[in-house]
């Protein structure tokens, strides 16, 4: 039975040209996290594996940095970065947990962080 929940940074906004940290946290389970995959819509951005460490997709290497922790830092943001991001936690023995973050990249300087929320 999967008892865990993923807490994410939820709906967030950031300024064009700036950077943002995408963060997920798995709680309420004793399952071992073996790997976390980060995806943007239909693109694999990065993988953090418990044994192998980080792999950043080559096409994102210039603008994506690993961490902090299992999170992901997006740099030099453009309006095209607006959209859904997913953290996919592969765990043993529970299976897979998925968290969703929506990022809006704004032209102006009025970007503010959204509230944290939980996905069961």
């Amino acid at each position: 039975m999967m008892t865990g929940t993923i807490e994410t940074t939820g709906n967030i906004s950031a300024e064009k040209g700036g950077s943002i940290i995408l963060q997920c946290h798995l709680s309420s389970t004793t399952a071992q996290v073996t790997q976390v995959n980060w995806e943007q819509q239909d693109q694999l951005l990065a993988i953090c594996n418990a044994d192998l460490g980080w792999h950043i997709s080559p096409s994102f290497k210039d603008r994506v940095a690993p961490g902090p922790g299992l999170g992901l830092t997006l740099q030099s943001l453009t309006v095209n970065d607006t959209g859904e991001y997913f953290c996919i936690y592969h765990t043993y023995p529970d299976g897979t947990y998925t968290g969703r973050i929506f990022l809006e990249v704004l032209e102006s300087s009025v970007a503010e962080h959204g509230a944290r929320f939980q996905i069961p």
Epitope: T34, Q35, E39, D42, Q43, L44, I47, N49, D51, L52, H55, S57, S59, H90, Y92, P93
Partner: antibody
Framework: EVQLLESGGGLVQPGGSLRLSCAAS????????MHWVRQAPGKGLEWVSG????????SYADSVKGRFTISRDNSKNTLYLQMNSLRAEDTAVYYC???????????WGQGTLVTVSS | DIQMTQSPSSLSASVGDRVTITCRAS??????LNWYQQKPGKAPKLLIY???SLQSGVPSRFSGSGSGTDFTLTISSLQPEDFATYYC?????????FGGGTKVEIK
């Protein structure tokens, strides 16, 4: 240099058993998921089974479930495939493969031929 | 199970030609799509992983694109050593599945 060397193939009668081995070297074996993929003569590639880096999680193709068992001994840097109740349609070259991040196969062994025939 | 459909099953081309091979998944697989090259009597070799990432040591004339259900492998200028069979493979979910292969032959 990464090397994967399969052994244990051969001729076996239908209903018989074989145990394939794959000796790994040149990398930290215990850090990688490993898979078996087979190829029947003149045919395409078919995934057979996979195992996580610590051996705690395994998966199988429906065509071999209940007959084949994948295992590994990280202290010996060796991957195994125990094949029971073999059928003629199991005849193939069996490749062991390294699967970083459980996403792609970056190294393959040279393969070992299993022939099931009476 | 996710079905992978490759086309064409075979093609004839000349050295220097631009060659395109397509692979379609029966459901969305994000970018969990890999391409392999296999020559007769040899093990497959990884060319492209995660839809568009070029494996280290693979010539830049090979490129991959696509996401979701439709993917493409392109060889920008076919070389003599490129005549082989090419397979796509999804790693979105188990069972992992391969396309039926595309044999690239000399015209």
């Amino acid at each position: 240099e990464v090397q994967l060397l399969e052994s244990g193939g051969g001729l076996v009668q239908p209903g018989g058993s074989l145990r394939l081995s794959c000796a790994a070297s040149g990398f930290t074996f215990s850090s990688y998921a490993m898979h078996w993929v087979r190829q029947a003569p003149g045919k395409g590639l078919e995934w057979v089974s996979g195992i996580s880096s610590n051996g705690g999680s395994t998966s199988y193709a429906d065509s071999v479930k209940g007959r084949f068992t994948i295992s590994r001994d990280n202290s010996k840097n060796t991957l195994y495939l125990q094949m029971n109740s073999l059928r003629a349609e199991d005849t193939a070259v069996y490749y062991c493969a390294r699967v970083p991040y459980a996403v792609w196969i970056d190294y393959w062994g040279q393969g070992t031929l299993v022939t099931v025939s009476s | 199970d996710i079905q992978m459909t490759q086309s064409p099953s075979s093609l004839s081309a000349s050295v220097g030609d631009r060659v395109t091979i397509t692979c379609r998944a029966s459901q969305s697989i994000s970018s969990y799509l890999n391409w392999y090259q296999q020559k007769p009597g040899k093990a497959p070799k990884l060319l492209i992983y995660a839809a568009s990432s070029l494996q280290s040591g693979v010539p830049s004339r090979f490129s991959g694109s696509g996401s979701g259900t439709d993917f493409t492998l392109t060889i920008s200028s076919l070389q003599p050593e490129d005549f082989a069979t090419y397979y796509c493979q999804q790693s979105y979910s188990t069972p992992l599945t391969f396309g039926g292969g595309t044999k690239v032959e000399i015209k």
